[in-house]
Interface confidence: medium
């Protein structure tokens, strides 16, 4: 699924993301927007072997277990595949131990280079909420 | 147990397509990409591209691409393979696999003959 | 794309002996490199994963050395079974690509 923006802010907001450990919702929009255009079914392969998946690319050398990363964690214990689907519920919960972890944000690439430090409210400008 | 069984061999004239089937038994079909693999005599093993079946994402080695197509039937939990504007040079045999990073199951292989 | 180069391309040997097969890289793969064999109209059996993992069911006259570019699959007295064509393949990067192949045949 593809979600519009205004839509996404919604689904997020309904799962406790706005403001979860000091973000507010626009930095999980833009993080979303940059990292998978909004795309629930993107996946990208890394030059680890690793590849990241969903709506906030998450990484399966750490956070989901897709069957062929070596020396994967799975510190969301679920299969990697969960994170593709149309409902964000996995992709929102493995996305609350992400942050949690120390680094914040920070832990998104495109969230760090596109996101951090800009005027991230506008992503959920316009938006019924 | 984790089984693949694919579609039996075919005979294809030159410039026509042909889709490959692979039926996925024993484990969660959406949660693991298969791959599909060529071998030809004097050739070895060439990988063609894998797709995870849960989302349709696909990824083609570049000498494979606009000459093969992948797509997943989550319903029957089979994968298929199209190639098309056959020639002699596709004639080979086609495996899929479990792609586990390395591939622990294979199909029995699929004999495609172009002439 | 990663090159696998195997040597040799063809070995006989007698039932008994102890042999070494090898698989170079054109890079370094870590230890992201796995051992098959295949027979005559058979599809690929592995054998070792992650350059040294024995997999269940496999032999243990079969072990599998190496990290980075240089890998060895060494069978300790070679069996009648164990004749057939052997490959290494890498899954440190795509596309994933196969070493063209060593041939164990009997002298």
């Known amino acids: 699924k593809v979600f519009g923006r205004c839509e996404l802010a919604a689904a997020m907001k309904r799962h406790g993301l706005d403001n979860y450990r000091g973000y507010s919702l626009g930095n999980w929009v833009c993080a979303a927007k940059f990292e998978s255009n909004f795309n629930t079914q993107a996946t990208n392969r890394n030059t680890d072997g690793s590849t990241d998946y969903g709506i906030l690319q998450i990484n399966s050398r750490w956070w989901c277990n897709d069957g062929r990363t070596p020396g994967s964690r799975n510190l969301c214990n679920i299969p990697c595949s969960a994170l593709l689907s149309s409902d964000i519920t996995a992709s929102v919960n493995c996305a609350k131990k992400i942050v949690s972890d120390g680094n914040g944000m920070n832990a998104w690439v495109a969230w760090r280079n596109r996101c951090k430090g800009t005027d991230v409210q506008a992503w959920i400008r316009g938006c019924r909420l | 147990q984790v089984q693949l069984q694919e579609s039996g061999a075919e005979v294809m004239k030159p410039g026509a397509s042909v889709k490959i089937s692979c039926k996925a038994t024993g484990y969660t079909f959406t949660t693991y990409w298969i791959e599909w693999v060529k071998q030809r005599p004097g050739h070895g093993l060439e990988w063609i591209g894998e797709i995870l079946p849960g989302s349709g994402s696909t990824y083609y080695n570049e000498k494979f691409k606009g000459k093969a197509t992948f797509t997943a039937d989550t319903s029957s939990n089979t994968a298929y393979m199209q190639l098309s504007s056959l020639t002699s040079e596709d004639s080979a045999v086609y495996y899929c696999?479990?792609?586990?990073?390395?591939?622990?199951?294979w199909g029995q292989g699929t004999t495609l003959t172009v002439s | 794309d990663i090159e696998l180069t195997q040597s040799p391309a063809t070995l006989s040997v007698t039932p008994g002996d102890s042999v070494s097969l090898s698989c170079r890289a054109s890079?370094?793969?870590?230890?992201?490199l796995h051992w098959y064999q295949q027979k005559s109209h058979e599809s690929p059996r592995l054998l070792i994963k992650?350059?040294?993992q024995l997999m269940s069911g496999i032999p243990s006259r079969f072990s599998g050395s190496g990290s980075g570019t240089d890998f060895t699959l060494s069978i300790n007295s070679v069996e009648t079974e164990d004749f057939g064509m052997y490959f290494c393949?890498?899954?440190?990067?795509?596309?994933?690509?196969f070493g063209g192949g060593t041939k164990l045949e009997i002298k």
């Open positions: 992650y350059g040294s």
């Open positions: 393949q890498q899954s440190n990067s795509w596309p994933r690509t």
């Open positions: 890079q370094s793969i870590s230890n992201n």
């Open positions: 696999a479990r792609g586990d990073g390395n591939y622990y199951y």
